[in-house]
């Protein structure tokens, strides 16, 4: 599972007029991390774990970066010709990742009124546009605006993603929080299903990092993929994650089934409660 930093910026227009503010959130490893407080011109940590990641840092450069990015996105929205009456939004999502082999990936996506219309792979400098005619028109608008100073744009995007990766590395290097290992709490529950069957659910919560194996076993052998139902691995708001796996079994055979969990080199098995 790579480490990632994800910037999500949104600007709004009303009746063709671009609004002065912008919304910005930053996610670190999928967790809400920073939010831009527009009134105070400050990037604010989201919750205690985010504060712990950087301790007593002021977030001064994060604040300035987000403010500059918001201004850029407002200018981009001003160049979209498609704006009719009412409320419209332009959203930019930038993601940079550092993988276990130290390779990096950076991408950027633009959405208009919630619809994806332009993506860029920063490494390959390749732009992708969905097939719809609206997306094509919007993409042409934005690409033309960005290409007005093509070299500056190219440099700008490479610098932006270099900054993203630099920030991510700084967070990873400086933070004990991101290097910690928090084992999951595993809880198995059962609920009655139809015709002598029961549904057994295995929940893992409050674990870090995100990588986890959670699967049902019968007589010590993992069940096939299609007989199990998995939940997404989701942030729980405390800098840790949660997930679940469920399967349906015959009543009376509970003792043959166990939930197998593997996380950060540790593993455990958990029986179905009787």
């Amino acid at each position: 599972e790579p480490h990632s930093l994800r910037y999500n910026l949104t600007v709004l227009s009303w009746d063709g007029s671009v609004q002065s503010g912008f919304l910005a959130e930053v996610h670190l490893d999928g967790q809400p991390f920073l939010r831009y407080d527009r009134q105070k011109c400050r990037a604010k940590p989201q919750g205690q774990w985010a504060e712990d990641v950087l301790g007593n840092k002021t977030w001064d450069r994060e604040t300035r970066d987000l403010t500059g990015n918001g201004k850029d996105l407002r200018m981009t929205l001003a160049h979209i010709k498609d704006q009719k009456e009412g409320l419209h939004s332009l959203q930019e999502i930038r993601v940079c990742e550092i993988h276990e082999d130290n390779s990096t990936r950076s991408s950027q996506h633009f959405y208009y009124d919630g619809e994806l219309f332009l993506s860029q792979n920063v490494e390959t400098e390749e732009w992708t546009v969905p097939q719809s005619s609206r997306a094509q028109t919007l993409a042409m608008n934005v690409r033309n605006f960005l290409k007005e100073d093509a070299m500056k744009t190219k440099t700008h995007y490479h610098a932006m993603h270099a900054d993203c990766l630099q920030e991510l590395r700084r967070y990873l290097e400086s933070s004990v929080v991101l290097r910690r290992r928090v084992p999951p709490m595993v809880n198995v529950t059962r609920s009655e299903a139809s015709e002598g069957n029961i549904t057994v659910t295995c929940r893992a919560s409050s674990f870090y990092p995100r990588n986890i194996t959670l699967t049902w076993r019968q007589d010590g052998v993992s069940l096939s993929h299609d007989t199990q139902q998995w939940g997404d691995v989701l942030p729980d708001g405390n800098g840790t994650y949660q997930t679940w796996v469920a399967t349906r079994i015959c009543q009376g055979e509970e003792q043959r089934f166990t939930c197998y969990m593997e996380h950060s080199g540790n593993h455990s098995t958990h029986p179905v409660p009787s």
């Epitope: 011109c41 002021t58 700084r170």
Partner: antibody, heavy 117, light 107 residues
């Protein structure tokens, strides 16, 4: 143009608290943090803390947490700093300075505080 | 707290000379350094922000450079009005801190 007008020099008795004022004009007072900075005679600058006039959120240098209290009055565009139980160590010039992304872009003329019995 | 060490304490130069002020941080603060000038009996004035960004209204002879822990403020041709104390300030870590200053004198 941006101006920060600070109150006049103060001679205070040890232990008697003192309140300094900083009146802002020429910009939207509630949109910017206000810093307070201390400078002892012949010495360097020391950051005391900052306050945001919109809701009075404050960030204090821990060294001054029992010494300085920052407040604002939005109706008069004025920031205040109260110094409690002053001693000779608190004799200094105190500046208010407007914050711009953690830099201090406009400064008041300073208020001289002398603590003496 | 971040310690900012300014050197030398006093710089003595002739008008027209190029002069450099040094500021060293006790740990990596990226580019979060700002420079101020304070004339005798005056308030500080912001000269350079974020290591190298110029400030509107400040003469172009003032420039800044550096990142990480070592930073420099340069006046490329000193004028008599530049006689003052010069302070660096960091904004990367709470609390915000200033260097002890360098006094610029004319020979």
């Amino acid at each position: 143009q941006v101006q920060l007008q600070q109150s006049g020099a103060d001679l205070v008795r040890p232990g008697a608290s003192v309140r300094l004022s900083c009146r802002a004009s020429g910009y939207s007072f509630t949109n910017y943090w206000m810093n307070w900075v201390k400078q002892r005679p012949g010495q360097g600058l020391e950051w005391i803390g900052m306050i945001h006039p919109s809701d009075s959120e404050t960030r204090l240098n821990q060294k001054f947490k029992d010494k300085a209290t920052l407040t604002v009055d939005k109706s008069s565009n004025t920031a205040y700093m109260q110094l409690s139980s002053p001693t000779s160590e608190d004799s200094a010039i105190y500046y208010c300075a407007r914050d711009d992304f953690f830099t201090m872009d406009y400064w008041g003329q300073g208020t001289s505080v002398t603590v003496s019995s | 707290d971040i310690l900012l060490t300014q050197s030398p304490a006093i710089l003595s130069v002739s008008p027209g000379e190029r002069v450099s002020f040094s500021c060293r941080a006790s740990q990596n603060i990226v580019t979060s350094i700002h420079w101020y000038q304070q004339s005798t009996n005056g308030s500080p004035r912001l000269l350079i922000k974020y290591a190298s960004e110029s400030i509107s209204g400040i003469p172009s002879r003032f420039s800044g450079s550096g990142s990480g822990t070592d930073f420099t403020l340069t006046i490329n041709s000193v004028e008599s009005e530049d006689v003052a104390d010069y302070y660096c300030q960091q904004s990367n870590i709470w609390p915000l801190t200033f260097g002890a200053g360098t006094k610029l004198e004319l020979k």
